[in-house]
Interface confidence: low
């Protein structure tokens, strides 16, 4: 077995008792912040599981990969990573599991090379609309972000602001059209009940979209038409009942798409006929032979691909005089 990721003998490690001095002077080339491990050869700094309450001020200018996972950061203020000279090479920033509940406007400003950002497993009760765009202009400077990982960022019910969590996240994704170059977006495990209809149209470069393990019931108002580069769409472990003709046609029209639909409670009644027909013909659904009915009870566990039109009936609607309670 190899050794664990969290301790690195090949990294130079700052002594825990050294205070990280805030200074206008640029850090020394080989300086490593207290409670961090640094490797100039790998251009990597790891400050992992150290209960840090703020981003170290004395990050080395060479850092390309920065791991700040498993800390207690709470808030990322504007310019949290702004340094003089700037962290011009920082390309991958992982802040997962650091108890962030607030990310303010401009938190990631002055990171000209930032390609990958992971904020997963933080209870983000307050994500500024301008967290990623940096400004409130209607059209912001393009963000360099290519991959944005926002899995399990939903806060506990009692910590949510009195507003739609979906709406808060989407506002940050769309502000200033800054994320036009985004290629990978992961939004798994966020209890999303719906996907605001305008979000995908404004992220035209997406290659990979992960919406798995949410609570999406329907895609009726979601358009995939503009996502001509989309390669994978993950919709596993949601609450989808059926995909309607418009959605099916849009998915079929995407040239590189692979769709993942496992573990949804498909309702196998007359409304499912179009989807069953499409599943039998399409090559875009991965593992389509595993899709099974959840409802009605008589259809439970039936394989969708094995159904025919005679199986897919809707109970007749009784006139009011014949209805029973």
């Amino acid at each position: 077995s190899s050794s664990p990721t969290s301790s690195a003998s090949s990294f130079s490690s700052s002594a825990p008792f050294l205070a990280s001095a805030v200074s206008a002077q640029p850090p020394l080339p080989d300086q490593c912040p207290a409670l961090c491990e640094c490797s100039e050869a790998a251009r990597t700094v790891k400050c992992v599981n150290r209960n840090l309450t703020e981003v170290p001020t004395d990050l080395p200018a060479y850092v390309r990969n920065l791991f700040l996972t498993g800390n207690q950061l709470a808030v990322l203020p504007a310019g949290a990573f702004a340094r003089r000279p700037p962290l011009a090479e920082l390309a991958a920033l992982n802040l997962s599991g650091s108890r962030l509940d607030e990310v303010r406007a401009g938190a990631f400003e002055h990171l000209p090379s930032l390609r990958q950002l992971d904020l997963s497993h933080n209870p983000l009760a307050d994500l500024s609309p301008f967290a990623f765009s940096g400004s409130n202009a209607s059209v912001s400077a393009p963000s360099p972000l290519v991959e944005l990982i926002l899995n399990h960022i939903v806060p506990p019910e009692d910590e949510r602001q009195n507003r739609s969590f979906e709406g808060m996240v989407v506002a940050a994704l769309l502000a200033g059209r800054a994320l036009q170059g985004l290629r990978r977006l992961e939004l798994a495990s966020n209890h999303f009940l719906y996907l605001p209809r305008d979000v995908l149209a404004q992220l035209p470069s997406l290659r990979h979209l992960d919406l798995s393990n949410n609570s999406l019931v329907s895609l009726t108002y979601v358009s995939f038409r503009n996502l001509t580069h989309l390669e994978s769409l993950h919709l596993e472990d949601n609450a989808l009942k059926v995909l309607h003709n418009g959605t099916l046609a849009e998915l079929q029209g995407l040239p590189h798409i692979r769709v993942f639909l496992d573990n949804n409670p498909w309702v196998c009644d007359c409304h499912m006929a179009d989807m069953v027909t499409w599943l039998k013909e399409t090559e875009v659904v991965q593992g389509k032979d595993r899709l099974t009915c959840a409802y009605p009870e008589k259809m439970r566990n039936r394989v969708l691909l094995e159904l025919n039109s005679a199986d897919l009936d809707c109970d007749p609607i009784l006139p009011p005089s014949l209805q029973t309670s």
Partner: antibody, heavy 121, light 107 residues
Framework: EVQLLESGGGLVQPGGSLRLSCAAS????????MSWVRRAPGKGLEWVSA????????YYADSVKGRFTISRDNSKNTLYLQMNSLRAEDTAVYYC??????????????WGQGTLVTVSS | DIQMTQSPSSLSASVGDRVTITCRAS??????LNWYQEKPGKAPKLLIY???SLQSGVPSRFSGSGSGTDFTLTISSLQPEDFATYYC?????????FGQGTKLEIK
């Protein structure tokens, strides 16, 4: 200490079936995606299959799709690979490995020692 | 699926040499590229993850670079224990393919 221990390998005839197991310990099993990788005699490593931490998502190499099934029992901290319709070209040492990070931004940081599967008449 | 092509397939070198192995992806994979070392009868071992990050416990003579489609594993000064087979692996696509391997032998 993280440990992965494969079992279930052996000699089987073409067309036969075998189930491999991988017992995991030393970490929170359900939090990690897991994978099976194999190395055939004289060949390189081949990624075979992977499964998400919850077991809700599974992935297969084209060479095994429809014949192999990956699964996991998180209550038993065990990963499985059910291999059906085995062929001579499935002969290999099979390793189970743990993914560190999400499936799409991951690397295999711990590996078992492997179990040998031989398909021959 | 994303194809990974390593070069060279085999390589002879001496202790103390600087060695470079390259890996090319059939499409851009950002920095989702890992390097593993395998020795006969042993389990593979992670060396480099995310293209350039050194795994814990791996000697600093190993380094990785590259992004997009072209990646490099460099061993700055070969040691006797480094003679092994090296593999790259992409985790950008939903199927995580390996390169065919580069066997590093003693000259």
């Amino acid at each position: 200490e993280v440990q992965l221990l494969e079992s279930g390998g052996g000699l089987v005839q073409p067309g036969g079936s075998l189930r491999l197991s991988c017992a995991a310990s030393g970490f929170t099993f359900s939090s990690y995606a897991m994978s099976w990788v194999r190395r055939a005699p004289g060949k390189g490593l081949e990624w075979v299959s992977a499964i998400s931490g919850s077991g809700g998502s599974t992935y297969y190499a084209d060479s095994v799709k429809g014949r192999f099934t990956i699964s996991r029992d998180n209550s038993k901290n065990t990963l499985y690979l059910q291999m059906n319709s085995l062929r001579a070209e499935d002969t290999a040492v099979y390793y189970c490995a743990r993914y560190y990070g999400g499936y799409y931004s991951a690397w295999m940081d711990y590996w078992g020692q492997g179990t040998l599967v031989t398909v021959s008449s | 699926d994303i194809q990974m092509t390593q070069s060279p397939s085999s390589l002879s070198a001496s202790v103390g040499d600087r060695v470079t192995i390259t890996c090319r992806a059939s499409q851009s994979i950002s920095s989702y590229l890992n390097w593993y070392q395998e020795k006969p009868g042993k389990a593979p071992k992670l060396l480099i993850y995310a293209a350039s990050s050194l795994q814990s416990g791996v000697p600093s003579r190993f380094s990785g670079s590259g992004s997009g489609t072209d990646f490099t594993l460099t061993i700055s000064s070969l040691q006797p224990e480094d003679f092994a087979t090296y593999y790259c692996q992409q985790t950008y696509g939903y199927l995580h393919t390996f390169g065919q391997g580069t066997k590093l032998e003693i000259k």
